[in-house]
């Protein structure tokens, strides 16, 4: 990825930004992401083992969309979380979360998206991840399932 | 809360931004938008025949919401796409997409929204559009159905 | 449309930003928000009686998510609004709104989110609020229900 310049401060610096898209070879949590091909962006932020690693403290808008679908609805509870991990806290911190229950008609083919987005004060070395409850129900098309952020 | 510095450009320049709202005389795809009245914004970006035309290469946050509703649910599959067209690609590029299937109880009055938003590296002369699968099921209230972007 | 200047500061100034999270002692409309503890942000914007008060005219990205859930679905219509009030207009202005009808199977435990986010030109002294139709169906976890903005 080439870096993208942010508006014109004295020295041209990389705009901290990421847009990662669904990767269908995710086998476990957290989700893994495509960080190289397609409509992907990665500049001034690092991608490491499913996570976006912050390298400059500041305010970030963080977002994610997950597209769930299935052949035959059984209304399994769905959850979609963006969470943060760092060395200072033993526990993961859930930043944003969406849950769905009783969302389709039993037996029918179904599809539904969950979108999350908000502003957070992130610290250098924070790691951000996305978790879902039912990996087998996620569709990983690049336009449908994604994870991103940018520094304000 | 500690304060966070905003970016420091020397010269006052137009912020590239758009927020267009639903226009009920949309008769075909892509959707048409209100670009003049109400809570509309259009600055440093051109609106032309349904599309937002980029005139400066850079990083943009692009978003859209569509409000679908009907008098009697028959669970027609719904889709909501933000796509891009330019001279370099013969094909439209779907940037973001939401799909819904089996989302309401047959025969009942129903309503549902789809929200999309993400960061993209756009090039001068790219044109962005919004497409839906079922035009007759879209409600075009300005607070409910909209399309916008801003340059980071 | 008049063009909107992007931020010009020579001096490092507070980034105008807010991220407020759900507060379970909300008893009436508009919703009340947690403005002190947890993953809350409040800088260069004031929180007053459920509302975010703008103190500098300009372009803002405004967002909110509300998490609705219930023990036994009866498909009460749900609405989620971000609206604006100021001294110049007698009427509230609905900026963004989401509605849901016929969204779950009668009698079942259910859960659903509504997300809104867009850009608006706000004026100093504008007050922004969030309204929902069914307060008793809102879950106020900080990761699930929130309200925020930042100045572009």
């Amino acid at each position: 990825q080439i870096g993208h310049p942010s508006p014109p401060p004295e020295k041209k610096e990389l705009r901290k930004v990421a847009h990662l898209t669904g990767k269908s070879n995710s086998r476990s949590m957290p989700l893994e992401w495509e960080d190289t091909y397609g409509i992907v962006l990665l500049s001034g932020v690092k991608y490491k083992k499913g996570g976006l690693v912050i390298n400059e403290t500041g305010l970030y808008f963080v977002y994610s969309k997950v597209y769930f679908r299935g052949q035959s609805c059984n209304n399994l509870p769905l959850s979609h979380k963006v969470y943060m991990r760092n060395s200072k806290y033993p526990q993961d911190l859930v930043m944003m979360e969406g849950k769905m229950m009783s969302y389709c008609t039993t037996g029918q083919m179904w599809a539904r998206s969950s979108y999350l987005g908000a502003v957070f004060n992130l610290t250098s070395a924070d790691h951000l991840y996305v978790n879902v409850s039912e990996l087998s129900l996620v569709n990983f098309e690049e336009s449908q399932t994604f994870f991103g952020l940018y520094k304000l | 809360q500690i304060g966070h510095p905003s970016p420091p450009p020397e010269k006052k320049e137009l912020r590239k931004v758009a927020h267009l709202t639903g226009k009920s005389n949309s008769r075909s795809m892509p959707l048409e938008w209100e670009d003049t009245y109400g809570i509309v914004l259009l600055s440093g970006v051109k609106y032309k025949k349904g599309g937002l035309v980029i005139n400066e290469t850079g990083l943009y946050f692009v978003y859209s919401k569509v409000y679908f509703r009907g008098q009697s649910c028959n669970n027609l599959p719904l889709s909501h796409k933000v796509y891009m067209r330019n001279s370099k690609y013969p094909q439209d590029l779907v940037m973001m997409e939401g799909k819904m299937m089996s989302y309401c109880t047959t025969g009942q009055m129903w309503a549902r929204s789809s929200y999309l938003g993400a960061v993209f590296n756009l090039t001068s002369a790219d044109h962005l559009y919004v497409n839906v699968s079922e035009l007759s099921l879209v409600n075009f209230e300005e607070s409910q159905t909209f399309f916008g972007l801003y340059k980071l | 449309q008049i063009g909107h200047p992007s931020p010009p500061p020579e001096k490092k100034e507070l980034r105008k930003v807010a991220h407020l999270t759900g507060k379970s002692n909300s008893r009436s409309m508009p919703l009340e928000w947690e403005d002190t503890y947890g993953i809350v942000l409040l800088s260069g914007v004031k929180y007053k009686k459920g509302g975010l008060v703008i103190n500098e005219t300009g372009l803002y990205f405004v967002y909110s998510k509300v998490y609705f859930r219930g023990q036994s679905c009866n498909n009460l219509p749900l609405s989620h609004k971000v609206y604006m009030r100021n001294s110049k207009y007698p009427q509230d202005l609905v900026m963004m709104e989401g509605k849901m009808m016929s969204y779950c199977t009668t009698g079942q435990m259910w859960a659903r989110s509504s997300y809104l986010g867009a850009v608006f030109n706000l004026t100093s002294a504008d007050h922004l609020y969030v309204n929902v139709s069914e307060l008793s169906l809102v879950n106020f976890e900080e990761s699930q229900t929130f309200f925020g903005l930042y100045k572009l």
Epitope: - | S28, M29, L31, S124, A125, Y129 | -
Partner: antibody, heavy 117, light 109 residues
């Protein structure tokens, strides 16, 4: 006025660049410069337009790929055509239209392209 | 997007009236983005009507455009010999797509 040039007799498979030159004015804001063609004894067929404000380009679905419209200067618009076939034999017109609605106000006299072996 | 001019040729006497129809496969932009052109042999087309019903400058008021959405009509009244020509409709659509109708020849007797 507008004037087209570059029309010629060419062999199938060849490429050609047509030029549209404005005299007495330059392409003004809010207008598109377009190419339209007309095969002998046939109707008009829209090919492509370019927005004079930002060089955004718009093509007929059948024209994508083989036809390229560009604006090298404020008074010149080009149309490049590749892999020419006999079906491309036509008079090629350039015309200006308002960007917000179709109104091809000003037309050039046309330039003839003949594709034959 | 397909524009269909149902009649390939119409004829009428001097002083009479002719009506030319143009049907679009989908609604034109803002329901009125349709124009009409007159073309004579070995000449480029000339704009007559734009936005469905607005008369282009210098065009006599004998030419009248009407219609909305997908159905449009050009009416030429008080027909003159000089009106003998081929008439084309053109539609503008969202995404800045244009299309021409197949043309209708007007023969003045």
């Amino acid at each position: 006025s507008l004037e087209e040039s570059g029309g010629d007799l060419v062999k199938p498979g060849a490429s050609l660049t047509l030029t549209c030159t404005a005299s007495g004015f330059s392409f003004s804001s809010g207008y598109d410069m377009c190419w339209v063609r007309q095969a002998p004894g046939k109707g008009l067929e829209w090919i492509a337009c370019i927005d004079t404000d930002n060089d955004a380009t718009y093509y007929a679905s059948w024209a994508k790929g083989r036809f390229t419209i560009s604006k090298p200067s404020s008074t010149t618009v080009l149309l490049q055509i590749t892999s020419l076939t006999a079906a491309d034999t036509a008079t090629y017109f350039c015309a200006t239209t308002h960007g917000d609605y179709v109104a091809f106000k000003l037309w050039g006299p046309g330039t003839l392209v003949t594709v034959s072996s | 997007q397909v524009l269909t001019q149902t009649a390939s040729s119409v004829s009428a006497a001097v002083g009479g009236t002719v009506t030319i129809n143009c049907q679009s496969s989908q609604s034109v932009y803002k329901n009125n983005d349709l124009s009409w052109y007159q073309q004579k042999p070995r000449q480029p087309p000339k704009l007559l009507i734009y936005q469905a019903s607005k008369l282009a400058s210098g065009v006599p008021s004998r030419f009248k455009g009407s219609g909305s959405g997908t159905q449009f009509t050009l009416t030429i009244g008080d027909l003159e010999c000089d009106d003998g020509a081929t008439y084309y409709c053109a539609g503008g659509y969202t995404a800045s797509i244009y299309a021409f109708g197949g043309g209708t020849e007007v023969v003045v007797k």
